[in-house]
Interface confidence: low
């Protein structure tokens, strides 16, 4: 038999500094958690420990912090290189900046194989990104040799940036041929390793033969066997064993996301490249792992350049800014709730007697939310900690909408509810009551909007045929998140301000911010 | 071989409206972000607008934002900027730029320009 | 806005020198910068992008170096089709900036 440890991590999204517990910045240094520098202590750790160890990132190393904002990707590259990955697979955030974005700071100089055998790029793009990235590696590791075939989730091009010369291909379709080649090279132990979310990698498990093992991403899924050792409750046992068509138990990782943990996991085959046995679970990667001091050094020297960002205070907030998943993707959030009345109160123009305001209705995916703000770090909030909040560098866009294609959106916000999809709605300016119990497509029972043709704003049922004008991300003005309806029928788009900027603007106005949830989003059940 | 070929220019009066066109051939053009760069007679280069190739990403300088905007129809490979308000600080050369995919990126291939003068 | 300064701002110079321009950003921008060189009349052409790439077609004696504020552009033996403008340009962030250039004239 023959033993490799599979060490790895996914959607670090850009937390190459240590966090607090809920991924937001560190606020209490003795209580943060993960980081690179203490990542690559608890690697090496592992590397001098145990024999044959593979460091692996199932994507989504790109988007989430000032890092990335600043750098642009080439952090990615640099600090990946210093903990020498041995591959990665491509998730979607790494198309943020369009292909170039990812070609130039990371495939360039990243000194690890980075991997997706379902993304093919066509026309121009084919010859320049030729070589840079590919759909499987073969590593040597110890005196055996292990195949590493690489995914991307096939919706990357309605979340990102790719362009229009990458074609993504369905996952299993794309894989299977490149696993069967990496047979015929007499490659007999495999790991999937990609970016398409936990029901996918079950799937790959299922239904591509000769696959090993499977590593994944996207869905920031939390697999652990035991009594989990922090707040993420485990979606299931770690690892998450799968029988595959062919009667082989596969067994199916992630690690949660944000570096916190470091997916450990024990792998023994056969002389034939059979799993004998799979075992480990994520390590928290809490204080009591100190940060590796080089690497901390490099980290610090890196910071100098993002310091003009981070230290100047916008406002205060005297409450606790939920801009978690768990709230934003399933519930009314009042970080939701503050960015829509900052993108409200940005848009006030009192250009005619008749209306208090030209607009007053505010759509906010939860997706788009994507960290919390601590309240207990002085109430001090930075442009950085907007950033982590608000990474995407969008704009906060003005459409005039039929009240009809309002209803299909927020119908559309909870046709998988439940899910931790990105499409849920957070509002401003809106009143509206989902009902779970009916079918997808006639969930909203109750929608109400806020008037303008008014001197006291007051709450109006929505009239489908009424024009609506509704302030919202440039992301689903272009149909982002699935709101192709937004797209399709929008009646006039005008593109408006940076994102972040229009939230610390507001907040520098108000100085002192304490947004509440106060039942713009309501559940019920029964009849109306 | 990338060929940008702007057109549009003249001579207009302060406050009034112009709109340039630049036709591109050679390449994809609903792969790139585009952009629009001026520059005054005897001085230097200033960043009008940018667009990403589709439409998602927008960006204007501060002196022309609100009074000019940049669109592209990438069935017809073309890239407008259509010019409200104009004022005399306005006249220069205005040249069409092949970016990269993603908008900030370095603009690789220029067209020859064409001129706006802004005269009453 | 990020200010791109170029200096110097004029130059004379023989065929066969060697000829350094600096441009210097108001604010870190990686390798997010790019040179243009640019003649009577003519657009500008695209010489090096992220700092120190070469754009294809443009030959070898032009190269730049520099990361965060501070960049050059070097040409290692200046010949007759090298008196021009010279231009850098940030794209780490909008609004996209050009520094204010630098002539190269013959001595």
């Known amino acids: 038999a023959w033993e490799l440890t599979i060490l790895h991590t996914n959607d670090v999204h850009s937390r190459l500094e240590q966090t607090s517990e809920d991924s937001s910045k560190c606020v209490n240094a003795s209580r943060c958690m993960g980081g690179v520098a203490r990542l690559f202590t608890k690697v090496q750790q592992i590397r001098r420990a145990e024999p044959n160890v593979l460091l692996l990132d199932a994507g989504d190393q790109y988007q989430g912090t000032i890092w990335f904002t600043v750098y642009k990707g080439a952090e990615v590259a640099h600090f990946m290189n210093a903990l020498r990955y041995d591959a990665m697979a491509l998730g979607n955030h790494e198309f943020d900046n369009g292909v170039e974005g990812l070609i130039e700071p990371l495939l360039k100089e990243a000194k690890f194989p980075i991997l997706s055998a379902n993304i093919k790029a066509k026309g121009p793009l084919a010859s320049q990104i030729s070589g840079l990235y590919l759909p499987y590696k073969v590593l040597p590791v110890g005196d055996e040799v292990v195949g590493i075939v690489g995914y991307t989730s096939k919706e990357t091009p309605f979340l990102s940036n790719p362009g229009t010369n990458l074609v993504f291909e369905d996952e299993i379709t794309a894989l299977q041929p490149e696993v069967d080649k990496l047979k015929t090279l007499n490659v007999n132990k495999i790991i999937a390793l990609g970016h398409s979310g936990f029901e996918m990698d079950k799937l790959i498990a299922q239904k591509v033969r000769g696959v090993d093992v499977v590593v994944g991403g996207h869905s920031n899924t939390f697999l652990y066997t035991g009594n989990p050792p922090s707040k993420e409750v485990p979606a299931g046992k770690y690892p998450f064993i799968v029988t595959s068509d062919d009667g082989r138990k596969v067994p199916v990782v992630q690690a949660y996301a944000f570096g916190k943990y470091l997916g450990y996991l024990k792998i023994e085959f056969d002389e034939r490249g059979n799993v004998i046995s799979s075992h480990g679970n994520p390590i928290l990667l809490n204080s009591s792992i100190p940060e590796d001091p080089s690497i901390k050094a490099d980290i610090n020297k890196w910071r100098i350049k993002l310091d003009n960002y981070s230290t100047q205070e916008l406002g205060k907030t005297i409450v606790y800014l939920d801009g978690s998943s768990q709230s934003c993707r399933f519930r009314e959030c009042n970080m939701g709730n503050l960015i829509c009345d900052a993108m409200i109160n940005n848009n006030l123009r009192h250009t005619d007697e008749m209306f208090w305001n030209h607009v007053s209705m505010c759509i906010l995916n939860g997706g788009g939310i994507r960290s919390p703000i601590d309240e207990r770090n002085n109430g001090t909030i930075t442009w950085e900690n907007l950033a982590a909040v608000l990474p995407f560098g969008g704009t906060f866009d003005l459409v005039q909408l039929k009240g009809s294609t309002l209803k299909k959106a927020f119908e559309h916000s909870v046709h998988r509810y439940g899910q931790s999809t990105g499409e849920f709605l957070q509002v401003g300016g809106i009143h509206v009551v989902y009902d779970l119990s009916r079918k997808p497509g006639d969930r909203v029972v109750k929608l109400d909007v806020l008037c303008t043709k008014c001197r006291v704003p007051s709450y109006d049922p929505l009239k489908m045929d009424e024009v609506y004008k509704v302030i919202l991300p440039n992301f689903l003005a272009n149909g982002g998140d699935g709101f192709q309806m937004i797209k399709d029928e929008l009646l006039r788009h005008d593109s408006g301000d940076q994102d972040i900027n229009v939230v610390s603007t507001y907040i520098s106005k108000m100085k002192v911010i304490y947004p509440a949830v106060e039942g713009r989003i309501k559940f019920s059940t029964g009849s109306h | 071989e990338v060929q940008l070929v702007e057109s549009g220019g003249g001579l207009v009066q302060p406050g009034r409206s112009l709109r340039l066109s630049c036709v591109a051939s050679?390449?994809?053009?609903?792969?790139?972000?585009m952009h629009w760069v001026r520059q005054a007679p005897g001085k230097g280069l200033e960043w009008v607008s940018g667009?990403?190739?589709?439409?998602?990403?927008?960006g204007y300088a501060d002196s022309v934002k609100g009074r000019f905007t940049i669109s592209r129809d990438n069935a017809k490979n073309s890239l407008y900027l259509q010019m409200n308000s104009l004022r005399a600080e306005d006249t220069a050369f205005y040249y069409c730029?092949?970016?990269?995919?993603?908008?900030?990126?370095?603009?690789?291939?220029w067209g020859q320009g064409t001129l706006v003068t802004v005269s009453s | 806005d990020i200010q791109m300064t170029q200096s110097p701002s004029s130059l004379s110079a023989s065929v066969g020198d060697r000829v350094t321009i600096t441009c210097r950003a108001s604010?870190?921008?990686?390798?997010?910068l790019a040179w243009f060189q640019q003649k009577p009349g003519k657009a500008p052409k695209s010489l090096i992008y992220?700092?120190?790439s070469l754009q294809s077609g443009v030959p070898s004696k032009f190269s730049g170096s520099g990361s965060g504020t501070d960049f050059t552009l070097t040409i290692s033996s200046l010949q007759p089709e090298d008196f021009a403008t010279y231009y850098c340009?940030?794209?780490?962030?909008?609004?996209?900036?050009f520094g204010g250039g630098t002539k190269v004239e013959i001595k």
């Open positions: 340009q940030q794209y780490n962030s909008y609004p996209l900036t």
């Open positions: 992220a700092a120190s």
């Open positions: 604010q870190g921008i990686s390798n997010y």
């Open positions: 050679g390449f994809t053009f609903d792969d790139y972000a």
């Open positions: 667009i990403s190739w589709n439409s998602g990403s927008i």
């Open positions: 730029a092949q970016g990269g995919y993603a908008i900030l990126t370095a603009l690789e291939y």
